[in-house]
Interface confidence: low
């Protein structure tokens, strides 16, 4: 499977259940691991810190004991466990630690992990809330007039809204420069689209729209293949009853059906 | 202890400088202020540190204007680049210099870096279709203000357009919709007091053009002249995808 680097991790849990947030800030000889919560529109705030030497959580005042617990499955590895979840526990959770920088100084800066989005919901969702793709191939007008073509990858009916999309040529690991719309809410799920414009010389290459999402099947990146294309001029018989949609761009309908 | 970032958002063109204000309240005499950048992926990146007893901090394009008496610590980002678009947080550090110290954050300021001011450019408009789905692709226009209309008598649903900065420093946009009669849908765009239609860009020839999948081992083309080409789409990682042509 493809490797999408960087943030964009999410965990979706029902209310009253528990959640695990893994710290990806790999530090050696860390004395304390801090846990912060950032909720949209609010300031990030520390919830607690974990005293590594004494295996002890120290909570900020006002937080209920037993709600948070730092688990260390192995040395230099930390997991925050949240119990009895409520919807207001939703947000981005960060682990952090002080990097002392120059050993002559007391401390230098606080380093943060890449963040995990926790979504706590009571909504009854479909069994399959992975992104469902539809592909669009370049219009003939664009390829003819601009010597370039745009591929569009539409992803629908996914939950939660945390998603990461990138593009690659088939036999390359280079990430191509693409553009995307905001993630949009549609009823109880989300949709997003991403598009890639390539020069004419690349239109005969196969392209991949690669999608990372919490609910992808088997937890692997979903790869949506865009076939190589070429621009042909086809002489039509105007009397042919199929000529109505012969002007259309190739239609490739990709539909997911739940098993 | 409190940190206030009064600007919730600010926009500025590339190459200019932007100043983000941050006020704080503290009873400590000695402390540190930190600035962080939060990427769209939510990663929190350390930018610069200002010590309460230090000269104004500077690191690359980031500089701090620190006024201890006014309890103000403004961050200036010079020579703005498109990648500077992000949310910026100011944070006050405990004075203990201990590994247990926490940071007290502000609510953050969202910075949007816009393209530089430039001559107005008319967009190109193209329609892409797939089943009931229609996408209107609007390319390389300036300024940003635009209205995109997908024209159809049988609308199922439409979505707000995505307007983004193109690699060339202009704007691109895509508007998506679902229509029962997708074959007849066209796109019209109002930009700079002019209307541009997707039909203006259709290639006029005596023959009918197709963009079709390149023939490979996996792609067999029927001989019928008005064929709808077939494509094999590999879907090992997609639940039960069906391909309809």
């Amino acid at each position: 499977s493809s490797n999408l680097e960087g943030g964009t991790k999410s965990v979706t849990r029902p209310t009253r259940s528990s959640a695990e947030i893994t710290c990806d800030l790999t530090v050696i000889n860390a004395f304390y691991i801090h846990w912060y919560l950032h909720q949209e529109g609010k300031a990030p705030q520390r919830l607690l810190y974990y005293d590594v030497s004494n295996s002890k959580d120290v909570l900020e005042s006002g937080l209920s004991p037993g709600k948070y617990y730092t688990h260390t499955p192995r040395r230099w590895s930390w997991i925050l466990i949240l119990r009895n979840l409520i919807e207001n526990d939703s947000g981005v959770y960060y682990c952090a630690t002080w990097d002392r920088g120059n050993p002559k100084t007391h401390y230098y800066k606080k380093l943060f992990g890449s963040g995990t989005t926790l979504v706590v919901t009571d909504k009854q969702l479909d069994a399959d809330v992975s992104p469902k793709p539809t592909i669009f191939l370049p219009s003939i007008a664009e390829t003819k007039l601009q010597k370039a073509g745009t591929y569009l990858c539409l992803l629908e009916k996914f939950f939660p809204d945390v998603i990461k999309i990138h593009w690659q040529e088939k036999k390359s690991n280079t990430i191509l420069g693409s553009q995307e719309g905001n993630t949009m809410k549609t009823n109880d799920t989300y949709m997003k689209f991403s598009w890639l414009t390539v020069p004419e010389k690349s239109l005969d290459k196969e392209h991949r729209c690669i999608v990372r999402h919490e609910n992808n099947k088997n937890g692997v990146d979903q790869e949506i293949i865009f076939p190589p294309i070429k621009t042909d001029v086809i002489t039509m018989d105007p009397k042919d009853n199929c000529s109505k949609d012969a002007n259309d761009t190739l239609l490739l309908q990709l539909t997911n059906t739940s098993a | 202890q409190k940190v206030t970032q009064a600007q919730s958002s600010v926009s500025m063109p590339v190459r200019k400088a932007v100043t983000l204000n941050c006020l704080y309240e503290t009873s400590w005499w000695s402390y540190y202020i930190f600035w962080y950048k939060q990427l769209p992926s939510k990663e929190m990146i350390f930018l610069i540190r200002q010590g309460s007893d230090e000269q104004n901090a500077k690191s690359g394009r980031y500089s701090v204007n620190f006024k201890k008496a006014a309890k103000s610590v403004a961050l200036t980002i010079s020579a703005l680049q498109l990648e500077d678009s992000a949310k910026y947080f100011c944070a006050l550090g405990d004075p203990g210099g201990l590994n247990t110290d926490k940071l007290i954050f502000g609510k953050g300021t969202r910075v949007t870096v816009e393209p530089r001011s430039q001559p107005h450019t008319k967009p190109s408009v193209f329609v892409m279709k797939n089943g009931t789905n229609v996408a209107c692709l609007v390319k390389e226009f300036y300024p940003k203000d635009i209205r995109i209309n997908l024209v159809s008598s049988k609308k199922i649903t439409e979505f707000d357009p995505a307007i983004v900065i193109s690699p060339s420093g202009k704007y691109n946009a895509v508007k998506l919709g679902k229509y029962e009669d997708s074959n007849s849908v066209t796109c019209s765009v109002q930009h700079d007091n002019k209307t541009v239609h997707s039909t203006d860009f259709e290639v006029k020839t005596d023959s009918t053009d197709h963009v079709k999948p390149k023939e490979t081992e996996n792609t067999k083309q029927p001989s019928k002249s008005c064929h709808k080409p077939k494509a094999i789409v590999h879907t090992e990682k997609v639940n039960m995808m069906s391909l309809t042509v």
Partner: antibody
């Protein structure tokens, strides 16, 4: 492709000076650290110096402290080892090396990256002899 | 400084043999230990990092382990191309230090 190429070695008299260069490609010196390791003829490996361009921190082995200076020119994507007051025991093949980052976030709380060296140059021979 | 005491300094073995080289750190270095292979006239090559993690592209017959301050490199079945000198290295604290090396020769 990551590559490190050392140059600047040669024969020098005791008390003399040499400047070794380590030209990097495939990554930026400013986002990494560069380390010099030497190997005397028929002997083992000895770490000499390290530089962290982003912070400017430098570290030296006791045997070279005060005589050698490590630096980097990020615009040229090159690291240097300025060697002064050379002695016969400085005779060695000098390698520059880059640390291996196998996690997106990998820091040691002492303030330097906590990483082994995965890319090495081919080495340049420094001979100190009268 | 952390001393890395490597043993043996040399050993003779045959193709197919299981070979073990050990390194003892004079104080705790967490898991900040690497193993390198070096052939005459060539730069060292990274085999193992973080005491037991196999570097990409390195054959799986090489493995590393840690027990307290003792670190071990094992070659499960020696191949002709494995005859070389092997070094351990601690990189958890400056100064970075290497073991004296173990030369693996053909019996």
């Amino acid at each position: 492709e990551v590559q490190l190429v050392e140059s600047g070695g040669g024969l020098v008299q005791p008390g003399g000076s040499l400047r070794l260069s380590c030209a990097a490609s495939g990554f930026t010196v400013s986002s990494s650290s560069i380390h010099w390791v030497r190997q005397a003829p028929g002997k083992g490996l000895e770490w000499v110096a390290s530089i962290y361009s982003s912070s400017g921190y430098t570290y030296y082995a006791d045997s070279v402290k005060g005589r050698f200076t490590i630096s980097a020119d990020t615009s040229k994507n090159t690291a240097y080892l300025q060697m002064n007051s050379l002695r016969a025991e400085d005779t060695a093949v000098y390698y520059c090396a880059r640390p291996y980052y196998w996690y997106p976030y990998y820091y040691w709380s002492g303030g330097w990256e906590y990483a082994a060296f995965d890319y090495w140059g081919q080495g340049t021979l420094v001979t100190v002899s009268s | 400084d952390i001393q890395m005491t490597q043993s043996p300094s040399s050993l003779s073995a045959s193709v197919g043999d299981r070979v073990t080289i050990t390194c003892r750190a004079s104080q705790s270095v967490s898991s900040a230990v690497a193993w390198y292979q070096q052939k005459p006239g060539k730069a060292p090559k990274l085999l193992i990092y973080s005491a037991s993690s196999l570097y990409s592209g390195v054959p799986s017959r090489f493995s590393g382990s840690r027990s307290g301050t003792d670190f071990t490199l094992t070659i499960s079945s020696l191949q002709p191309e494995d005859f070389a000198t092997y070094y351990c290295q601690q990189y958890g604290e400056y100064p970075i230090t290497f073991g004296q090396g173990t030369k693996v020769e053909i019996k």
